[in-house]
């Protein structure tokens, strides 16, 4: 910004009033008025040229200082060229000096030399020639000085001619200020500017209203320099919640609108789902049914939980059951649904039921899935099982109300047994299986049948209440097809798969495991 | 004091020359534009001639043009009108004047002497 | 060559009248015109430059003014001593020209 000078002295505006002194007296200087630009003028002019020796003073009236640090003179003054005046060439000079002194009180008409001290001599840029003169074209110089750091109440400024033709149209004291001013919604105040020319005065600005320095940022701040100028500034103030940015000022977000932190940015219209906001709001109140998570940001429409899953199946493959389901027909606006299984099992002698989480296990945990289907195996036989599978979303924890669907299944055998082979020789094959912990309390018996592959007119049976058995009595080098069925006090369990195991040939003969 | 008295006027035959002189004192001469005015008797005032501070820079009304001559001695703080050729017409109090600026070139008078009469007649 | 018309050429007026007189000028020139008093025997006196700034020492009494080639000089309150024949001059260009004057007198 500009600086804004405070006038201290105006010669030309104060229309001959001011009086000054000079000195010698009633000699050298002398006020007169003329016309230039069609526009009377009052000017001080002195014009001894031709003889020598000339020290003609003209001093200012007492200038109060006031705040000013450092003053800025500006002189607009003509000069005549010297040839313009034959024999005066040896005395004619065409330049003046400019002295300033300060005081604490007015001397009045006690005029005294020594207290003055020189500030520079004053040579026009354009002097006045006759050609000039005689056409009415004046050559008018403008000259500007500074002096400080003052530190007395005021001052006097004093113009020595030493025999110049020169006519001083225009003395203007004045001291600069940085003006008030409004910058990144900040407020600075009108400051004086310093005195010393490297230096820049730090000045604090005020956030103006409804405006805050966000957080971690830095408190406003900019420089004053000695010419009035406001420079680097620092830090910035930022509208408000429940305020934007309108000039520089802070305006209150319309209704309808909303702005939830103190930013750069506008207000912003009421997401979907919200009701009207009023005047300056910093949020916008969902509708009825409709919610916010606390970690969704104040833009976002409001959403609701999620429907049901819309279609579960439960397809049952011995102790196992395969769950499948799809996504909710009404998302609740939201992206974030995942699905809960949950699993409750029924006795059907007793009807007795209850959770059955610690006997089953699911090919992935069961809550926060993101998936569509999941497994559920060691499940037990002759059991009736519902499972219920929940959609959740990000708002489902603010209603109480639960969005599931449910499906039951019959688990009629158990899981098939699953064999190995633990040991082999030219007479025999010994059998391992196992069977899910849970279905294990329900089998009373293992049936192990098995025969010489490729002869389906004869099989054998054993029963045995453990996990393993050796069957022998077989033929060397001969592959047989054995299978592993759970008995129960119901029937018969699922049977496992027919493997095929092979006696070791006389050659390789020996107890070796496979 | 700031003073002009003019010198040299008298009764001339026509046909006859003249030389007035005009002192200035009480202000430093050489910057001014200086004047001549004549004024016949009973009538208005009329310019005559005008000379520049340097004295290179002259002007003359067309009813002297040719006849009369400006000029300056700025060391003896002096003008000059040199008449040749005087006419019955040229019967005239003739005043000297000051340019009043220094500053800017300003044909109002503000200085004039109290004038000498040149009579021309036969 | 500009000229310049002075009117009236005479006024008598009483002590404390307001007196006008006014010069036309032939052609524009500007601001620059003077008004001077002229009293009998005596050389002439400036009262008025650049059409109407005053003199230093000359009394407020007197003004003058400009409306386009019109110049008028104005005395406020007529005084006995303000007997005396008032001249305007062009000083725009040259030759410089005076008006024919306008003789005031005090009934």
């Known amino acids: 910004a500009q600086g804004k000078e405070v006038v201290l002295l105006d010669f030309a505006a104060a229309g001959g009033e001011l009086g000054w002194l000079t000195h010698p007296y009633g000699k050298g200087w002398d006020l007169m008025q003329n016309i230039m630009n069609d526009m009377p003028i009052y000017m001080y002019s002195v014009c001894n040229v031709m003889s020598g020796d000339q020290d003609n003073w003209l001093r200012t009236n007492w200038v109060y200082r006031g705040e000013a640090e450092r003053i800025f003179i500006e002189l607009k003054f003509t000069v005549r060229d010297c040839n313009s005046f034959p024999g005066g060439a040896s005395s004619c000079k065409e330049t003046f000096n400019l002295y300033y002194a300060e005081s604490d009180l007015d001397y009045g008409t006690n005029f005294q030399k020594r207290l003055f001290t020189k500030i520079d001599t004053i040579a026009p840029d354009e002097i006045t020639v006759s050609s000039d003169f005689e056409a009415r074209h004046v050559k008018l110089n403008v000259e500007e000085r500074s002096v400080g750091p003052l530190t007395r109440k005021g001052f006097y400024l004093a113009f020595q001619d030493i025999g110049a033709c020169v006519a001083l149209l225009s003395v203007r004291v004045y001291y600069k200020k940085c003006p008030e001013l409004l910058q990144g919604l900040a407020h600075f105040p009108e400051t004086i500017a310093g005195s010393d020319a490297p230096s820049l005065a730090t000045v604090a600005g005020t956030c103006v209203d409804h405006a805050v320095v966000p957080p971690g940022g830095e408190e406003p701040r900019m420089h004053c320099a000695v010419d009035g100028e406001w420079l680097v500034p620092i830090g910035q103030c930022l509208c408000q919640a429940g305020y934007e940015k309108v000039e520089d000022a802070c305006q209150a977000c319309s209704p309808g609108f909303f702005k939830f932190e103190a930013s750069e940015s506008p207000c912003l219209e009421c997401p979907e789902h919200t009701l009207p906001s009023p005047e300056g709001a910093t949020s916008c109140e969902c509708e009825e049914g409709f919610f916010r998570a606390p970690q969704d940001p104040a833009s976002m429409p409001c959403t609701r939980p999620p429907s049901a899953p819309h279609y579960l199946t439960a397809v049952g493959m011995g102790a196992k059951v395969e769950l499948r389901w799809t996504p909710p027909q009404d998302s609740g606006g939201r992206e974030d649904i995942v699905y809960s299984v949950t699993c409750e099992q029924c006795w059907p002698e007793s009807g007795e039921c209850g959770p059955c989480e610690a006997s089953v296990r699911y090919s992935e945990p069961p809550h926060g899935l993101t998936r569509t289907s999941v497994t559920v195996s060691d499940l037990e036989p002759h059991m009736n099982y519902t499972f219920t599978v929940e959609a959740r979303n990000g708002v489902s924890g603010l209603v109480t109300s639960r969005s599931f669907r449910t499906a039951s299944v019959s688990i009629n055998q158990t899981e098939p047994p699953k064999v190995r082979l633990e040991g082999r020789s030219t007479t025999s094959l010994s059998v391992s299986w196992s069977i899910p912990p849970p279905q294990q309390s329900r089998v009373w018996k293992y049936e192990v049948t098995y025969r010489k592959k490729g002869d389906s007119n004869s099989y054998n049976v054993r029963r045995t209440e453990g996990f393993s058995v050796t069957l022998d009595d077989l033929a060397p080098d001969t592959t047989y097809l054995v299978q592993v069925q759970a008995l129960t006090q119901e029937g018969q369990g699922a049977g496992s798969k027919v493997h095929e195991f092979q006696t070791l040939s006389p050659e390789g003969s020996g107890n070796l495991a496979v | 004091e700031v003073q002009l008295l003019e010198s040299g006027g008298g009764l001339v035959q026509p046909g006859g020359s003249l030389r007035l002189s005009c002192a200035a004192s009480?202000?430093?001469?050489?910057?001014?534009?200086m004047l001549w005015v004549r004024q016949a008797p009973g009538k208005g005032l009329e310019w005559v001639s005008r000379?520049?501070?340097?004295?290179?820079?002259?002007k003359y009304a067309d009813s002297v043009k040719g006849r009369f001559t400006i000029s300056r001695d700025n060391s003896k703080n002096t003008l000059y009108l040199q008449m040749n050729s005087l006419r019955a017409e040229d019967t005239a109090v003739y005043y000297c004047?000051?340019?009043?600026?220094?500053?800017?070139?300003?044909?109002?008078?503000?200085?004039w002497g109290q004038g000498t009469m040149v009579t021309v007649s036969s | 060559d500009i000229q310049m018309t002075q009117s009236p050429s005479s006024v008598s007026a009483s002590v404390g009248d307001r007196v006008t007189i006014t010069c036309r000028a032939s052609?524009?020139?500007?601001?620059?015109l003077a008004w001077y008093q002229q009293k009998p025997g005596k050389a002439p006196k400036l009262l008025i430059f650049?059409?109407?700034t005053l003199q230093s020492g000359v009394p407020s009494k007197f003004s003058g003014s400009k409306s386009g080639t019109d110049f008028t000089l104005t005395i406020s309150s007529l005084q006995p001593e303000d007997s005396a024949t008032y001249y305007c001059q062009q000083y725009n260009d040259y030759p410089l020209t005076f008006g024919g004057g306008t003789k005031v007198e005090i009934k």
């Open positions: 000379i520049g501070s340097s004295g290179g820079y002259t």
């Open positions: 009480g202000f430093t001469f050489s910057p001014y534009d």
């Open positions: 650049g059409a109407s």
């Open positions: 052609q524009g020139i500007s601001k620059w």
């Open positions: 004047a000051r340019a009043r600026s220094v500053v800017v070139s300003s044909d109002a008078f503000d200085i």
